[in-house]
């Protein structure tokens, strides 16, 4: 019989460069069996991660893989910064690698990052 | 339960490859990543290299170039190649699964021994 | 990449006494660190994931602590079947390992 485990799957040091003032969604891929575990996005800050209980937060579906995804209405300066997302699974946490933010303010632009930057999602289906 | 098995002992001669092969079983390989870490012996663990669940990798930089994983799904068994061999080499050679947050190895092989000599 | 210096390299601890191994990052790694034991003639298992989780199994006088660059494995009360070698690992960005320490009954 096959283990089925609840899994994360952001990559190491994984990172987005975004522009403040722009909507962004930030996925964790998640892979379950039955139930769909219950999830949470915490910013990091110092030695703990504090927990965005107040941040709209929405699941897609697709066929393979499941993301939870945190959104920024719009992305303000201070969500610069490293996120991790987390499951809770018959009793267990697992945590993901964090996966960084790094926000431009729009004053300080001197030029928007590209529309390839902008869509790639460099933690797809593995970590 | 979640076995993870190597392919057993080679002797090869500097210069030639060695393909060690890990077959899995308890757990799907396109669910998990593995691993490969090698120890000389009566030394220290050096991770190689892993295969993510989509089959892309990620490999030490001190073995890029001369290191290649793959896996193969439907025979649940991820394979590691070694080119360029040298007697720095001869090690044993471990696959292990990630966790599923992929941020520690929870399960590993028993090994595959390879000595390079001429 | 990031080097993890363990300390010390090797370690003689009387039975129930405490043994407390060291692990130092040359840059932080977050609580990315997972700690190893490796008895003679086998294969790694895990201990500790996350810094300080104590895996699946692993008897609790197994104790994991730290954060950012430096880490802490403590046994707090050694058992024979404890003597083996102890291996650190960050896999905050590609996995590196400790040299290991080798814990031996005096």
């Known amino acids: 019989k096959e283990s089925c485990d609840v899994q994360l799957y952001i990559k190491r040091q994984s990172e987005h460069s975004i522009l403040a003032g722009d909507p962004f969604e930030l996925e964790c891929p998640v892979k379950y069996c039955a139930n769909r575990p219950h999830v949470t996005w915490c910013k990091l800050n110092g030695t703990t991660c504090v927990k965005l209980e107040d941040r709209q937060t929405s699941w897609k579906e697709e066929k393979n893989i499941s993301f939870f995804i945190l959104h920024f209405e719009p992305v303000l300066p201070n969500d610069n910064g490293s996120y991790r997302c987390s499951a809770n699974f018959q009793s267990n946490l697992i945590e993901s690698h964090s996966t960084t933010l790094y926000v431009t303010d729009v004053k300080s632009a001197s030029e928007r990052p590209s529309k390839d930057e902008m869509a790639s999602r460099p933690w797809l289906l593995y970590r | 339960q979640v076995q993870l098995k190597e392919s057993g002992a080679e002797v090869k001669k500097p210069g030639a490859s060695v393909k060690v092969s890990c077959k899995v079983s308890g757990f799907s390989l396109t669910g998990y990543g593995v691993n490969w870490v090698r120890q000389a012996p009566g030394q220290g663990l050096e991770w190689m290299g892993m295969?993510?669940?989509?089959?892309?990798?990620d490999y030490n930089s001190k073995f890029q170039g001369r290191v290649t994983m793959t896996k193969d799904n439907s025979k649940s068994t991820v394979y590691m190649e070694l080119s360029s061999l040298r007697s720095e080499d001869t090690a044993v050679y471990y696959c292990a699964r990630d966790r599923p947050d992929g941020r520690a190895m929870d399960y590993w092989g028993q090994g595959t021994m390879v000595t390079v000599s001429s | 990449s990031i080097v993890m210096t363990q300390s010390p390299d090797s370690l003689a601890v009387s039975l129930g006494e405490r043994a407390t191994i060291n692990c130092k990052a040359s840059q932080s790694v977050s609580n990315d660190v997972a700690w190893y034991q490796q008895k003679p003639g086998q294969s790694p298992k895990l201990l500790i994931y996350?810094?300080?989780n104590r895996y699946t199994g692993v008897p609790d006088r197994f104790t994991g602590s730290g954060y950012g660059t430096d880490f802490t494995l403590t046994i707090s009360s050694l058992q024979a079947e404890d003597v083996a070698v102890y291996f650190c690992q960050q896999d905050y960005s590609s996995p590196t390992f400790g040299g290991g320490t080798k814990l031996e009954i005096k």
């Open positions: 295969i993510w669940i989509d089959g892309s990798t």
């Open positions: 996350y810094a300080s």
